[in-house]
Interface confidence: medium
């Protein structure tokens, strides 16, 4: 059976697969997924290994029409470095010389300057090029190699291993060499995989059942450290509770060097955030941190300085802390918009069982704003999801130059933010450089400001506008309002009408359904339309909703189903990557973000059309 990293190299023109007959003969044969000799896998960014021989594809020289055969894998050799060129060409790195079928006289696979059909290769059984099953570095734990990546294949007691092994061990722990020759270099580490006893790599907090892994002997960049945690179904550490910080202070007290945690300001337009999307509500900075120096976007915990936090350049090499298990956040269920009949008094706007109102004109200090909201039967608004924030931005009449009090504050416990309405903090969205909590002036209250409505801490004594929120009064079944210019069941936003397609459909089926309604799969033109759509679908239980974006027509170039330019994107992390397909919006914790899915997957969808009676604005000129 093929493991997920292995593949057969397939030439569509001949309908045959590459077959390593021997180290000196790499030919083709009828494709057979059970044949070890036809299985290959990437073992570094640029090396392809034969699974049967544990040797790498290479050439004797970078010249036209030389045989491609198998060599002992050597990560430094220029003659074993391959790269995917446009579409399905595979070439020797840095040259216009391609992996080629050979010809009638030449049975062996050859290196050739021609880029025709005989130089085009796919993963057998897919339409993908060979790089779509690329190499993922595996960062080691413990051992003596400072967390370096596994080197596959590696030699141990004169035997080659292409995977982690428990050879030499009686306890079943899986390890790998971090250079190709363990026997000579003696460098190794344990693999970030599940094996008997791997739980002892973690410390479980008995109070919360959350587990932590302290990798103090590693030396990785922030991004490498994060990858290592993710390889163990974990994330870099987030700290949202004082108890959690206390536990970790104890756990790291014998150490001296800094350890990466998940806090970062890597998002271009927002502020400090945890990589696991926990809310940034508890602050434990070292005095003088966070420093505003550009590039210092990642955060380390300093065991030698009472486990306080310091921002550093992300390329520094440090140890790190991973976290897995129950999140420390209280479980707090936000009702889906469709679950709650929402009836609001005049001038209040309904959303998901609550009513909202912006007070823009009567500026008040935070304490007085809170009093006013409470007199009206509510509180300063709490915000628990990206959908709720996007509802406020897109539908409450929020303006880009607004600066409005919300209920978040750290008045009660310094550096520990809470909502004034007592609901748990499950979500934060800080502006770039925030929360700054400048020491020379108390910034204990929080405002929403700027075009995106992100947050900043502020001195509570500033007179500003504010947003109130209250529980709605349920008044029997809700009357479905027909919005002006839209048919029944469609929702209006600006010039358009939108409808959720409730039948699970492939991308093509969804597109057809929209067309049948004289509409099309939704396009998303800007941040504000995205905000509306996020609030429209984000709290629903289904995982995905199709948009009209795909790269069906031209692989690698994403286009809308209607002739409209792609001027805005909202990709989820690691998207779109190299995956071809169709684009759907996520719900839940990644609400609104775009993922590339296989077009024949089934999902719900959003249709869109011009509202009736709306004058079409002129198309923007480029």
């Amino acid at each position: 059976l093929l493991d997920t990293r292995q593949f057969l190299i397939y030439n569509e023109d001949h309908k045959r697969c590459v077959d390593a007959v021997s180290p000196s003969a790499v030919q083709t044969a009828a494709c057979n997924q059970d044949a070890e000799s036809q299985k290959f896998r990437w073992v570094s960014e640029s090396q392809i290994m034969s699974v049967a021989f544990k040797l790498c594809l290479g050439v004797p020289s970078k010249t036209d029409w030389v045989a491609i055969t198998l060599y002992a894998c050597d990560s430094k050799s220029e003659f074993q470095k391959w790269e995917c060129k446009n579409d399905t060409l595979l070439g020797i790195k840095g040259e216009d010389l391609f992996f080629n079928y050979g010809n009638r006289q030449e049975k062996n696979i050859m290196l050739y300057k021609g880029s025709g059909l005989w130089s085009r290769w796919k993963i057998y059984g897919t339409t993908d090029n060979l790089c779509s099953r690329g190499y993922e570095a595996m960062y080691t734990l413990l051992g003596n190699a400072n967390g370096a990546t596994c080197a596959f294949p590696f030699k141990f007691e004169n035997k080659w291993y292409a995977d982690c092994t428990s050879a030499g061990r009686s306890d079943g722990w899986l390890w790998c060499g971090t250079t190709t020759d363990y026997d000579t270099d003696k460098l190794f580490g344990y693999c970030p995989l599940k094996f008997e006893g791997s739980e002892s790599l973690w410390n479980k907090d008995p109070l919360t059942s959350v587990s932590y892994q302290i990798n103090s002997k590693s030396a990785l960049t922030w991004h490498q450290a994060r990858k290592s945690c993710q390889q163990q179904n974990a994330e870099l550490l987030s700290i949202t509770e004082i108890h959690e910080q206390t536990y970790l202070t104890g756990l790291t007290s014998s150490l001296t060097s800094g350890l990466w945690i998940g806090l970062n300001s890597l998002s271009f337009n927002s502020g400090w955030q945890w990589s696991d999307r926990s809310p940034f509500r508890y602050l434990n900075w070292l005095p003088g941190s966070p420093s505003a120096e550009p590039g210092k976007s990642c955060v380390s915990l300093n065991p030698g300085k009472n486990a306080k936090w310091e921002n550093l350049e992300c390329v520094q090499k440090l140890g790190y802390i991973c976290k897995k298990g129950n999140t420390t956040l209280n479980s707090f269920v936000i009702p889906s918009e469709s679950d709650v009949p929402t009836h609001c008094p005049s001038q209040w706007w309904p959303y998901a069982g609550h009513c909202y109102k912006i007070h823009r004109d009567e500026k008040k200090i935070q304490r007085d704003a809170l009093t006013t909201c409470r007199k009206e039967g509510g509180d300063l608004t709490s915000i628990h999801t990206i959908e709720e924030l996007d509802f406020i931005i897109s539908q409450l009449g929020y303006e880009p130059n607004d600066e409005l009090w919300i209920g978040l504050n750290d008045i009660k416990i310094q550096m520990y933010f809470e909502w004034s309405d007592g609901t748990p903090v499950t979500f934060t969205k800080w502006l770039r450089g925030e929360p700054s909590h400048e020491n020379n002036r108390q910034e204990d209250c929080v405002v929403m400001k700027g075009k995106d409505g992100y947050w900043a801490d502020r001195g509570c004594e500033w007179p500003l506008g504010y947003i109130c929120k209250m529980k709605s009064r349920s008044q029997g079944p809700e009357i479905v309002e027909v919005e002006k210019g839209c048919r029944k069941g469609w929702k209006k936003h600006h010039f358009y009408c939108y409808m959720i397609g409730h039948t699970l459909s492939t991308f093509a089926e969804a597109n057809q359904t929209c067309n049948n309604e004289n509409a099309y799969l939704t396009t998303i033109e800007d941040r504000y339309e995205q905000a509306f759509l996020t609030s429209f679908v984000g709290l629903r239980p289904e995982k995905y909703f199709w948009t009209g974006l795909s790269d069906i027509q031209t692989k690698g170039t994403f286009q809308w189903t209607i002739e409209e330019e792609v001027r805005f994107t909202h990709w989820n992390s690691d998207m779109p990557g190299r995956k071809p397909g169709c684009v759907a919006m996520r719900t839940g914790i990644a609400g609104g973000l775009w993922d590339v899915l296989k077009c024949d997957e089934k999902a719900k969808f959003v249709c869109k059309h011009w509202a009736e009676g709306v004058t079409h604005p002129p198309k923007p000129t480029t």
Epitope: L142, G143, N144, F156, A167, G168, R169, S170, D171, W173, W175, Y182, K186, F188, Y190, G197, E199, S200
Partner: nanobody, 118 residues
């Protein structure tokens, strides 16, 4: 490296008790688990009991309910309390440490002889 020294063996009557000790020195912070094994004359070495760094224990069926393995982290020592001894418990008892600092996990002591005879 890890060095292991066993003590506490000797001659005991059937039904009697003995307590074996195994003291570890060297890179002891790297020990993941410790165990006791025994080898009777002309037989294969077999596992008797083991204890992990987290305190989980495991026993061979033949000694369950009679033998108890424990550890004293402060003294870097593992013990085997042997009660209700039988003649078939006669063997050389070896201490083993499983370490994580090299791929070669097992370090052994020299062994201590236990003889159960009337």
């Amino acid at each position: 490296d890890v060095q292991l020294v066993e003590s506490g063996g000797g001659l005991v009557q059937p039904g009697g008790s003995l307590r074996l000790s195994c003291a570890a020195s060297g890179s002891i912070f790297t020990i993941n688990a410790m165990g006791w094994y025994r080898q009777a004359p002309g037989k294969q070495r077999e596992e008797v009991a083991a204890i992990t760094s987290g305190g989980s224990t495991n026993y061979a069926d033949s000694v369950k309910g009679r033998f108890t393995i424990s550890r004293d982290n402060a003294k870097n020592t593992v013990y085997l309390q042997m009660n209700s001894l039988k003649p078939e418990d006669t063997a050389v008892y070896y201490c083993k440490a499983v370490v994580v600092t090299t791929p070669y996990s097992d370090y052994w002591g020299q062994g201590t002889l236990v003889t159960v005879s009337s």
